[in-house]
């Protein structure tokens, strides 16, 4: 087999908290040369085996490279809910993509506060 991507399809996290976005690539033959992370169509970060990690400037205060070839997304807001894509560029063997749906939920503190207010 050329290669496979394994990831959790759906994950959730609390507003204000953090989440790890992780894709696992396995192959007997293909060698990873670069990994791109996207939020919908917007590039979050690039990992190049040669050049290292580069986080898009718009996310640089909230996205931390790692662990491994994943990303840690911090200070989550409700607007961060949506699809995230990892793209593994390999040689030889081409391109492998994984998809994660992140649901950012209202923090438990907010939910408790709202319940008390009602």
């Amino acid at each position: 087999t050329a290669g496979t991507i394994d990831t959790k399809r759906n994950i959730s996290a609390e507003e204000g908290g953090s989440v790890i976005l992780q894709c696992h690539f396995s192959s007997d033959t293909a060698e990873v040369t670069q990994v791109d992370w996207k939020q919908q169509d917007q590039l979050l970060a690039i990992y190049s085996v040669d050049l290292g990690w580069h986080v898009a400037s718009v996310f640089s205060d909230r996205v931390v490279p790692g662990p491994s070839l994943g990303l840690t997304f911090q200070s989550l807001t409700m607007n961060d809910t949506g699809e995230y894509f990892c793209t593994y560029h390999t040689y030889p063997g081409g391109i492998y993509k994984g998809r994660i749906f992140l649901k950012v939920q209202e923090s438990s503190d907010d939910r408790n506060g709202l319940a008390q207010f009602q």
Epitope: T33, Q34, D36, K38, D41, L43, I46, S48, D50, L51, G52, H54, S57, H89, I95
Partner: antibody, heavy 122, light 107 residues
Framework: QVQLVQSGAEVKKPGASVKVSCKAS????????MGWVRQAPGQGLEWMGI????????SYARKFQGRVTMTRDTSTSTVYMELSSLRSEDTAVYYC???????????????WGQGTTVTVSS | DIQMTQSPSSLSASVGDRVTITCRAS??????LNWYQQKPGKAPKLLIY???SLQSGVPSRFSGSGSGTDFTLTISSLQPEDFATYYC?????????FGGGTKVEIK
Amino acid sequence: QVQLVQSGAEVKKPGASVKVSCKASGYTFGSYYMGWVRQAPGQGLEWMGIIDPSGGRTSYARKFQGRVTMTRDTSTSTVYMELSSLRSEDTAVYYCARARTPSSWPYGMDVWGQGTTVTVSS
Amino acid sequence: DIQMTQSPSSLSASVGDRVTITCRASQSINSYLNWYQQKPGKAPKLLIYAASSLQSGVPSRFSGSGSGTDFTLTISSLQPEDFATYYCQQSLLTPFTFGGGTKVEIK
């Protein structure tokens, strides 16, 4: 002003090596990636590789891996491109070019050297 | 490696014409697409980066559009100094490959 000045033309025999220099001035040398691009006579542009002058990390086009070495000297703000085992098809103008954005993924090359002509002939 | 295909390879146009050059990537490159202008015997010059952002000092008659795999460079009103060869380049995945070039000649 921001400037890249390359070394002069070279004539080499097949099998030899050539080392082209590119001296940067007018900006913080370590903050911008430097790429190398070549152009054979009457042909298009060919990307050879790139170097991070601060840490020395490099990425080479697979076509040139094993034959090309890109290095830098931070004390003189100079990057070097050495190409070995030269053949006639390496005859070209070699350009160094600075990446547009500092400390970021190289999004485009905004400042170019004047080019260095390398002729490989027996 | 990502292949970049430009079309046409050459075109003839007159001063004042609207000129469109296209560039297609063999896979999605998001908006990581640059356009360069090169005149004979000179180094290339960056015109457009990130598919549609105009490089400082470049006349506003140059514009870029597209994302994913299909991109366009438009010169809204061709000037005498615009006769040159134009190259696209992707900068998402190393090696940062160039298109084959489009030569814009005087009709």
